[in-house]
Interface confidence: medium
């Protein structure tokens, strides 16, 4: 999943509110013990920024050898740098490792722009601000990779945290989630909060800065705020949520509903921008363009080859819409809604001379692979990653960069009609999103 | 890092012609101007010529227009000063100069549109 760009036919009748109440589970029913609450020791465990990716501490091996590891949610292989490579200040030494095991195989991941290719094994694998638990996980050890570690990133490896079927050389690599659900206590259930600075971070400040959490086997109510709405999973392979409609600044793109989902719509925290299929990307464009037309921007700003400047403290945020997507909910012809704000989907760039100037890259792409919810979506929210119910629940997050006039929201319920067939069905291939 | 080499300065007669280059690395966006300045002994530094990427509109001082022309190669990441006629008024340091999109620059030859600067290149007229 990339970090740069990816560091990869009908209508939903409606889906504006209609002001009936529909039915839902409340955000406070009992479930299994350990999932809600707080979990203090893993607040703020998470370091880094949108454009390289968050990343979490772990350790692997005995002797534990700590490493930091980008957490990915459109990849399913734990896998780390296992020999020298210029970008890496530390990497993964098998040989120090008294309880490495190697299990003989290779495996090979190539992507759009780049790959890694390494050596697979198990070893024993912690998380020092995690729950209290080591568990054996295949690592791939990375011997050999192009265009994967970003320099200045400040991370050596990844953790692939969606299912088994897309994980590479095949399914039969067991993820690392699903072996410390199957060796451990942990509820099946990790939760997200990515919390975008709203400022460009150079790379002392990303080290001292806090990037967000990651809640492992729970959820923690002091890092959002009102309710949670759930999305169902559609399928166990990335994170595959459907889409039912998308508003800019409350105007319905009126575009069939299956266009989102073409040919899927994943969340995945390795992805900096929100992604999306061609056709509904010109539609967003040219409704955000028509929405902040008192500025004339250049063409190469909308393609994100460009940038744009204001004075420091001058962002005219007020000109930018906010963009809706609704996603399906959990009961029949119900739907609820998340909005982001500019401050979301025009990302800080920290690259300019003038630092005097606060410049921006525009963070909405186009995709040939579907609707990717990367950074610029998961930053407004906190994200629940519920496999145990096989949903996804989202709420404002209370680390949301926002102004004194608007805020990310999550609103529901919505009703809306014929959801099920805003999904695609897509014919069966391997493929990973990693830096596509 | 962003790096602006120039290169092509030097001492000519009035009437002559140089060729100025402006190699650019490092770059991680498009710029969106690109921009040729010049600064002669005692003088504020002033826009020579510019050029707004995607739009390909070129701007001339009027002091130049008709002599100078700026060209590019995006392939070389390069920028090109064609300078003929040469005044000795045009005797000065110049400057090749990148930057992105600034809603509150009033002109193309505002330096407040440009992020990074070149060192700079003597160009000498002699009469």
């Known amino acids: 999943t990339q970090h740069g760009i990816r560091l990869p036919l009908r209508s939903g009748l409606g889906g504006a509110p209609l002001g009936l109440r529909l039915p839902r589970e409340t955000d406070e029913e009992p479930e299994e013990p350990g999932r809600r609450g707080s979990f203090v020791e893993m607040v703020d465990n998470l370091r880094g920024k949108s454009g390289q990716g968050y990343y979490v501490e772990m350790t692997v091996g005995s002797p534990p050898q700590t490493l930091n590891i980008l957490v990915d949610t459109g990849s399913s292989n734990f896998a780390v740098g296992a020999a020298p490579h210029p970008f890496l200040h530390r990497y993964y030494q098998r040989q120090l490792s008294s309880t490495y095991r190697d299990l003989r195989k290779g495996v090979y991941v190539p992507y759009t722009q780049g790959k890694w290719e390494g050596e697979l094994g198990t070893d024993l694998v912690s998380i020092p601000h995690g729950p209290n638990v080591t568990v054996r996980a295949n690592i791939a050890a990375i011997t050999e990779s192009d265009k994967f570690f970003i320099n200045g990133s400040n991370w050596e490896g990844i953790l692939g945290l969606a299912y088994a079927e897309i994980a590479r050389p095949d399914d039969s690599l067991e993820p690392f989630f699903d072996s410390l659900v199957k060796q451990t206590h942990v509820p099946n259930l990790f939760s997200l909060q990515l919390c975008g600075a709203g400022f460009p971070l150079n790379q002392s400040e990303v080290l001292a800065s806090v990037g967000g959490s990651m809640i492992i086997g729970g959820i923690d109510h002091s890092l959002y705020t009102g309710s949670l709405w759930y999305t169902p999973i559609r399928r166990e392979w990335y994170y595959e949520v459907i889409i039912v409609r998308v508003e800019i600044n409350g105007q319905d793109l009126k575009m069939d509903c299956k266009e989102y989902n073409y040919d899927k719509s994943i969340v995945d925290s390795g992805t900096t921008n929100l992604r999306l299929p061609k056709k509904v990307f010109e539609a967003a464009v040219k409704s955000i363009k028509a929405a902040s037309s008192t500025e004339k921007f250049p063409d190469g700003f909308w393609l994100g080859e460009q940038l744009v400047c204001w004075q420091a403290g001058t962002t005219p945020w007020n000109i930018f819409p906010v963009i809706s997507l609704y996603l399906m909910g959990e009961v029949t012809n119900q739907s609820f809604r998340i909005t982001i704000l500019p401050q979301q989907y025009l990302r800080p760039v920290e690259d300019v001379a003038t630092s005097q100037d606060d410049c921006y890259k525009f963070a909405i792409s186009q995709s040939s692979t579907g609707t990717v919810m990367g950074a610029v979506i998961m930053e407004g929210f906190y994200v629940v990653f519920d496999r145990a119910r096989k949903r996804i629940g989202f709420a404002v997050s209370a680390c949301h960069v926002h102004d004194e006039f608007r805020t990310a929201a999550v609103e529901g319920p919505f009703v809306t009609l014929d959801m099920e067939d805003c999904g695609y069905n897509i014919p069966q291939t391997d493929e990973s999103t990693l830096m596509t | 890092d962003v790096q602006l080499q120039e290169s092509g300065g030097g001492s000519v007669q009035a009437g002559g012609s140089l060729r100025l280059s402006c190699a650019v690395s490092?770059?991680?966006?498009?710029?969106?101007?690109m921009g040729w300045f010049r600064q002669a002994p005692g003088k504020e530094r002033e826009g020579v010529a510019a050029?707004?990427?995607?739009?390909?509109?070129?701007y001339y001082a009027d002091s130049v227009k008709g002599r100078f022309t700026f060209s590019q190669d995006d392939a070389k990441n390069t920028m090109y000063l064609q300078m003929n006629s040469l005044k000795p008024e045009d005797t000065a340091i110049y400057f090749c100069?990148?930057?992105?999109?600034?809603?509150?620059?009033?002109?193309?030859?505002?330096?407040?549109?440009?992020?990074?600067w070149g060192q700079g290149t003597q160009v000498t007229v002699s009469s």
């Open positions: 490092g770059f991680s966006y498009s710029p969106y101007y």
């Open positions: 100069a990148v930057g992105h999109y600034r809603a509150y620059a009033t002109t193309s030859f505002d330096p407040r549109r440009y992020d990074y």
């Open positions: 050029i707004r990427k995607g739009i390909g509109t070129t």
